[in-house]
Interface confidence: low
């Protein structure tokens, strides 16, 4: 007869490992007992269990509660055992020694691989601001055995760099994602993808990018200067900009205080029925934590009694 086993048994941390050992004997041969031992290099053999055909399973104290026979039905020639809740320290070489009658003793060895799935973590980099050069957006670290694979899934253009640190029984892999911040990246997902043979599917951690910026300011409302005449109602100026964080707006008049009756409502400046007193230079000041911008316009309220219209100047400054 001969022993059938596996050269390598691979199991994920925490799962049960079946250590196979089957004696394929000739007709009439019987298995008396199967002895399982751990036989790592440089150490003496450590008994796991003894599987006796008559007396049943005896588990050594060091493995009490962790070694069992596979569930029924059982073949009397099958000396396989289950090692419950595999831990990384279980990784190594195991031997089953089968005593048969009348053929004598047989032995076979296998190695147990315990895969340690990674628990990845994603750490965002420093605050991203438009105008910066190549900047760390995020780093992703995963440790496992064997070493996990760490990649990035994103529409954002950037560069990656990886490094790994080997420990005694595992390896930690860190991948960094660098980019040149631009406002178009705002709200874009940056996903760290960790692959490992101990995972049923890739693990993904998503970070949403936030890039601070402030667009140039401009003022709308003076497109048709002929509408700005004495007596007109509902005239307004609207300050246009965008930014991250969202900006705040402030209106001032360069050549004096805001006329009475003029309403400031965030980005909008609302006028009462127009008079010549409303003529002047108005400034919209836009700011957020990142930057500030100004845009100024000159309002000339036309008198319909006069023959010719006056020019309107728009000036934008930052």
């Amino acid at each position: 007869g001969e022993l059938e086993t596996s050269d390598v048994v691979t199991v994920v941390l925490g799962q049960d490992a079946k250590l196979p050992c089957f004696y394929r004997g000739d007709s009439g041969e019987q298995v008396g007992q199967v002895a399982w031992a751990r036989v790592d290099a440089g150490e003496g053999a450590q008994e796991l269990a003894l599987l006796h055909s008559k007396y049943g399973l005896h588990v050594s104290p060091a493995y009490e509660g962790r070694v069992e026979q596979p569930p029924p039905p059982r073949n009397p020639l099958d000396g396989s055992v289950l090692l419950r809740n595999a831990v990384q320290a279980d990784e190594g070489e195991y031997e089953c020694r089968v005593s048969t009658f009348p053929a004598g003793s047989f032995q076979a060895r296998l190695r147990l691989r315990v895969l340690v799935p990674p628990l990845p973590s994603l750490n965002p980099g420093p605050a991203l601001e438009e105008g910066q050069g190549l900047t760390l957006a995020a780093s992703c670290t995963a440790e496992g055995s064997p070493a996990p694979s760490v990649t990035w899934d994103t529409e954002v253009k950037g560069t990656t760099s990886s490094r790994s640190f080997k420990h005694s029984r595992s390896a930690a892999v860190t991948s960094e994602f660098h980019l040149v911040p631009s406002r178009s990246m705002n709200g874009q997902p940056l996903t760290c993808v960790v692959s490992h043979p101990g995972l049923l599917q890739d693990q993904r951690i998503t970070h949403i990018l936030h890039v601070s910026f402030l667009a140039e300011a401009s003022v709308r409302g003076l497109e048709d200067q002929n509408l700005w005449h004495i007596g007109r109602e509902g005239a307004m100026l609207k300050c246009l900009s965008e930014g991250q964080p969202p900006p705040s707006y402030n209106w001032t008049r360069l050549d004096g205080p805001l006329p009475s009756g003029v309403r400031v409502d965030g980005d909008t400046l609302g006028f009462p029925p127009l008079t010549t007193e409303h003529s002047g230079i108005y400034v919209c000041h836009v700011s957020n934590e990142f930057s500030s911008r100004d845009s100024q316009v000159t309002v000339d309220v036309l008198d319909p009694q006069e023959d010719s219209g006056k020019q309107v100047d728009l000036v934008s400054a930052s």
Partner: antibody
Framework: QVQLQESGPGLVKPSGTLSLTCTVS??????????WAWIRQPPGKGLEWIGS???????YYNPSLKSRVTIYVDTSKNQFSLKLSSVTAADTAVYYC??????????????WGQGTMVTVSS | EIVLTQSPATLSVSPGERATLSCRAS??????LAWYQQKPGQAPRLLIY???SRATGIPDRFSGSGSGTDFTLTISRLEPEDFAVYYC?????????FGGGTKLEIK
């Protein structure tokens, strides 16, 4: 830097026994953490795993060759050897020895000898 | 035993272009798959292990992917020294087996 070097006769007669030795330099076979394997490649064909051995002497063989193969290790000489009995012309191949790390990655044959051509012919 | 089938048997590509080599296993090998490069008169050289991890000293133009039964080796920009025979190898189940190889030749 670990290096492997195969040695042995390049010509074996049919029905004879092929014997090769692999000498490991730059590292100790008995330091553990590695299996040591024999792999062969017939002319113009693919690779075939013959078997592997641990320094403790435990061996694993390809079932297709198991009845004819013996691999053993001599830690005092830092060598491991292959014996293949009852050879035929089909055993003509380049024979490589290789290192197989365990349990650390890469868990695949990462270092190979340069190979030795063995011809089975009368 | 697990049979590995590589395709195509021969692949003709121009230098600088991308090459994609396939390996299919007759049953799942999880991620226990490696890729080797072999040049005439030389021993195989380990490129990829664990299906997707590059071996030490292997340029990043080589990448591996897949798990279970379907695997791919990609060479992003072919250099003149990349033209060789490539083998996949499974070590998830005994006996350990190799694919029949893909010859990558200059177009």
């Amino acid at each position: 830097q670990v290096q492997l070097q195969e040695s042995g006769p390049g010509l074996v007669k049919p029905s004879g026994t092929l014997s090769l030795t692999c000498t490991v330099s730059g590292g100790s076979i008995s330091s553990g953490g590695y299996y040591w394997a024999w792999i062969r490649q017939p002319p113009g064909k693919g690779l075939e795993w013959i078997g592997s051995i641990y320094y403790t002497g435990s061996t694993y063989y390809n079932p297709s060759l198991k009845s004819r193969v013996t691999i053993y290790v001599d830690t005092s000489k830092n060598q491991f050897s292959l014996k293949l009995s009852s050879v035929t012309a089909a055993d003509t191949a380049v024979y490589y020895c290789a290192r197989d790390p365990f349990p650390e990655p890469p868990d695949a044959f990462d270092i190979w000898g340069q190979g030795t051509m063995v011809t089975v012919s009368s | 035993e697990i049979v590995l089938t590589q395709s195509p048997a021969t692949l003709s590509v121009s230098p600088g272009e991308r090459a994609t080599l396939s390996c299919r296993a007759s049953q799942s090998v999880s991620s226990n798959l490696a890729w080797y490069q072999q040049k005439p008169g030389q021993a195989p050289r380990l490129l990829i292990y664990g299906a997707s991890s590059r071996a030490t000293g292997i340029p990043d133009r080589f990448s591996g992917s897949g798990s279970g039964t379907d695997f791919t080796l990609t060479i992003s920009r072919l250099e003149p020294e990349d033209f060789a025979v490539y083998y996949c190898h499974q070590y998830g189940s005994s006996p350990l087996t190799f694919g029949g190889g893909t010859k990558l030749e200059i177009k």
